[in-house]
């Protein structure tokens, strides 16, 4: 069965910043801004076409 | 540290999996400068079908 | 059109090392990734390595990391292959070929093959 | 790293006959295959790319099919100017691994 789409997962660390609980709740202005800028971040890397968005964003402790 | 875990979307058949993670590694150092994220330890893996098709792209 | 012209044949000693090179023409140089594959006498392909020429990045098959190291001159529109400590299961044809564009996930063109052979 | 297993290693066919190749990988490549033909002392040459992609110039005799980990490439009528070895090869993810080859042959 073919979607048309393809999935891909993927994990990285940043290591400059701290985790703390307010990357637990979406609600937080911490949690939005860094999701905010990785969002931001990948449009710019995969700008070349193809890519569709990203989703189920997660962070956790390093 | 933060670890972020995520799930990107592509048009089928437009980027193989080596390439995902080739275009992002090639972009930390644009990423410490602009965003101020000092990215590594990156992993990209395909996503079996049954969890993607549940998943949408936003 | 497209072409991709090889160096020639070569015979080297045993431990020395050779430079093979892959000019590049009618096309832009930069905005192709170019591969090097390898070609045992009588066997199948074995892929190496490839670079991207307009910036540098390199990736290698682990098992010639330490065997190869590939370059490119962009004024002169050439890549350029280095194998060192030769053995004799280093005799091989040595191919360069070029990845299609964006999203182009094949070999379009390959050069014509140089052969380096190594033998006391 | 994903390993490319193509049968028959050779084959003997008349001309007219329809000759399927086969490639299983050792993973999903998702349709990132391909597949070449090279004739004695030349390079390689691009047939199919995609899977299923004929490139331009090729015949339409030749076809390719398949996905997830099994891929097959047919030529659904011989002819003598298709004696050769032909490919696969993963382009999924590095190292970009081929297939030991299929040498073909006319009866």
């Known amino acids: 069965l073919s979607t048309g789409v393809s999935f891909f997962f993927l994990s990285f660390h940043i290591s400059n910043l701290q985790f703390n609980s307010s990357l637990e709740d979406p609600s937080t202005d911490y949690y939005q801004e860094l999701q905010r800028d990785i969002s931001e971040m990948f449009l710019q890397i995969y700008k070349q076409g193809g890519f569709l968005g990203l989703s189920n964003i997660k962070f956790r402790p390093g | 540290s933060v670890v972020v875990q995520l799930t990107l979307a592509f048009r089928e058949g437009t980027i193989n999996v080596h390439d995902v993670e080739t275009q992002f590694n090639q972009y930390k150092t644009e990423a410490a400068s602009r965003y101020n994220l000092t990215i590594s330890d990156v992993s990209v893996s395909d996503v079996p079908f049954p969890f993607s098709a549940q998943s949408g792209a936003g | 059109q497209v072409q991709l012209v090889q160096s020639g044949a070569e015979v080297k000693k045993p431990g020395a090392s050779v430079k093979v090179s892959c000019k590049a023409s009618g096309y832009t140089f930069t905005t192709y990734t170019m591969h090097w594959i390898k070609q045992a006498p009588g066997q199948g392909l074995e892929w190496i390595g490839y670079i991207n020429p307009g910036s540098d990045y390199t990736h290698y098959n682990q098992k010639f990391k330490d065997k190869a190291t590939l370059t490119a001159d962009k004024s002169a529109s050439t890549a350029y292959m280095e194998l060192y400590s030769l053995r004799s299961e280093d005799t091989a044809v040595y191919y360069c070929?070029?990845?299609?564009?964006?999203?182009?996930?094949?070999?379009?063109?390959w050069g014509q093959g140089t052969l380096v052979t190594v033998s006391s | 790293d994903i390993q490319m297993t193509q049968s028959p290693s050779s084959l003997s066919a008349s001309v007219g006959d329809r000759v399927t190749i086969t490639c299983r990988a050792s993973?999903?490549?998702?349709?990132?295959l391909v597949w070449y033909q090279q004739k004695p002392g030349k390079s390689p040459k691009l047939l199919v790319y995609?899977?299923?992609t004929l490139t331009d110039g090729v015949p339409s005799r030749f076809s390719g099919s398949g996905s997830g980990t099994q891929y097959s490439l047919t030529i659904s009528s011989l002819q003598p100017e298709d004696v050769a070895t032909y490919y696969c090869?993963?382009?999924?993810?590095?190292?970009?691994?081929f297939g030991q080859g299929t040498k073909l042959e006319i009866k």
């Open positions: 993973g999903n490549i998702h349709n990132f």
């Open positions: 995609n899977a299923k």
């Open positions: 090869q993963n382009f999924w993810n590095v190292p970009f691994t």
């Open positions: 070929a070029r990845q299609g564009n964006y999203a182009a996930y094949y070999f379009d063109y």
